[in-house]
Interface confidence: low
């Protein structure tokens, strides 16, 4: 399978996975009219924008994404989201209210696909194996993250969104323990009472007990 024809960028290695550099190709003149007769996006926005859901990275400290991948994806998003553009609705569409922020005849592959280094076509990511969350010219999909043994899957990896992992019940991860899940505290220190249960991204919360009764 393949996709939106686009200029295949020069390959550059990104931590062992081959990717096409996504570079704005702006110029002094305006873009050609879009298929809807509207004026195209501004020069600075021509590289394309994210049109699918963002991956769950950074949504909360309880969600983990491999740091290397996180940097790769953020790098892609930073280069792909430099401007906004008028949304172009697809004619005669029977798949709900999906909207395009780039022309159907655009220069980037859509989210959920990547640029074939050999044919120049857009190849779909394999569900559960790889994903791309933004319009791109990457030469391979970003590999789906596998949850660690102390984690559980919050949402499965799709073609457009990475796996979301969270700590298993009874454990949590916060900014202080970003790399591993820690066991939740079993109770509050003497003189404090529990006001919030443990969640995958925070330990129990304890506050001072004004009456002096504490829980162990």
């Amino acid at each position: 399978a393949s996709g939106t024809e686009a200029a295949t960028a020069t390959p550059s290695k990104v931590w062992g996975s081959s990717a096409g550099r996504i570079e704005p190709r702006g110029g002094g003149r305006g873009a050609l009219p879009t298929s809807m007769g509207q004026q195209g996006p501004s020069a600075q926005a021509r590289a394309g924008r994210v049109v699918g859901p963002r991956s769950a990275q950074g949504a909360s400290p309880g969600l983990r994404v491999h740091k290397t991948l996180k940097f790769v994806v953020v790098g892609v998003l930073l280069q792909v989201v430099p401007g906004s553009a008028a949304t172009i609705k697809v004619h005669d569409q029977s798949v709900g209210t999906q909207q395009w922020e780039h022309s159907p005849l655009g220069e980037l592959c859509p989210p959920g696909s990547h640029r074939s280094e050999h044919s120049g076509a857009c190849n779909q990511c394999t569900e559960g194996v790889g994903y791309t969350s933004a319009s791109n010219n990457l030469f391979s999909c970003l590999p789906c993250t596998a949850c660690k043994s102390d984690e559980e899957e919050r949402s499965a990896c799709t073609r457009t969104r990475n796996t979301a992992c969270q700590c298993k019940p009874g454990t949590f991860r916060n900014d202080d323990s970003a790399e591993m899940c820690r066991k939740c505290s079993t109770g509050c220190p003497r003189g404090k009472v529990k006001v919030k249960d443990c969640t995958p991204w925070s330990d129990i919360e304890c506050v001072h007990n004004e009456s002096g009764n504490g829980h162990n």
């Epitope: 939106t4 295949t8 002094g28 003149r29 050609l32 569409q93 044919s119 076509a121």
Partner: antibody
Framework: EVQLVESGGGLVKPGGSLRLSCAAS????????MHWVRQAPGKGLEWVAG????????YYADSVKGRFTISRDNAKNSLYLQMNSLRAEDTAVYYC??????????????WGQGTLVTVSS | QPVLHQPPAMSSALGTTIRLTCTLR?????????VYWYQQRPGHPPRFLLR?????????GPQVPPRFSGSKDVARNRGYLSISELQPEDEAMYYC???????????FGSGTQLTVLS
């Protein structure tokens, strides 16, 4: 070998209808976008309509919007163009073309031989 | 004024090199676009020749010899198709097309008729 064979062309009166078909073979039809491109006698190429691999997304030239409908049947390896409210200016050879990709691009890598549609009273 | 302009006709002698021009209207920037070229011989359907964005980013059509090559002049807002060692069978109509956020109603240029002089 990739082959695209158009059929369904012919003589039709203004205001009439016609349905063009394109039989595809020699490739996995369901993984490619497809287009209809026409060429009026002695004129240049004009893109008419395009459809992505699954048939979910369809695009039309302004000149045919609301009158023509592109569709596909992946089980039958076939592409269609339903043409209603035909006008004299729709007279042309209609080519079926395969897109290089799943979605739609400028890269039309294989073309059929075309079928002639004549709209005349 | 059309978005894409091609001279209606050009000619060159057998064995020479010719460069066909596709000019993008000057309120648009060819630096952003890939330029596509199609050949149509008399009585035949069009044939995809090549796509050109830059020297490091281009693709040749199936069975298209390297005599056919693309280039761009961003300053002049033009795309070019060069054909070297002209042969009789190169006599055809050549159409350019632009890729990117282009209006789908302006996919193809008006075409250039190439005549090969013997």
């Amino acid at each position: 070998e990739v082959q695209l064979v158009e059929s369904g062309g012919g003589l039709v009166k203004p205001g009439g209808s016609l349905r063009l078909s394109c039989a595809a073979s020699g490739f996995t039809f369901s993984t490619y976008g497809m287009h209809w491109v026409r060429q009026a006698p002695g004129k240049g190429l004009e893109w008419v309509a395009g459809i992505n691999y699954s048939g979910n997304n369809k695009y039309y030239a302004d000149s045919v919007k609301g009158r023509f409908t592109i569709s596909r049947d992946n089980a039958k390896n076939s592409l269609y163009l339903q043409m209603n409210s035909l006008r004299a200016e729709d007279t042309a050879v209609y080519y079926c073309a395969r897109d290089h990709s799943t979605w739609l691009s400028r890269h039309l890598d294989y073309w059929g031989q075309g079928t002639l549609v004549t709209v005349s009273s | 004024q059309p978005v894409l302009h091609q001279p209606p006709a050009m000619s060159s002698a057998l064995g020479t090199t010719i460069r066909l021009t596709c000019t993008l209207r000057n309120d648009h920037d060819i630096g952003v676009y890939s330029v596509y070229w199609y050949q149509q011989r008399p009585g035949h359907p069009p044939r995809f020749l090549l796509r050109y964005f830059s020297q490091s980013d281009k693709s040749q059509g199936p069975q298209v010899p390297p005599r056919f090559s693309g280039s761009k002049d961003v300053a002049r807002n033009r795309g070019y198709l060069s054909i070297s060692e002209l042969q009789p069978e190169d006599e055809a109509m050549y159409y350019c097309a632009m890729g990117a956020r282009s209006s789908v109603t302006h996919v193809f240029g008006s075409g250039t008729q190439l005549t090969v002089l013997s």
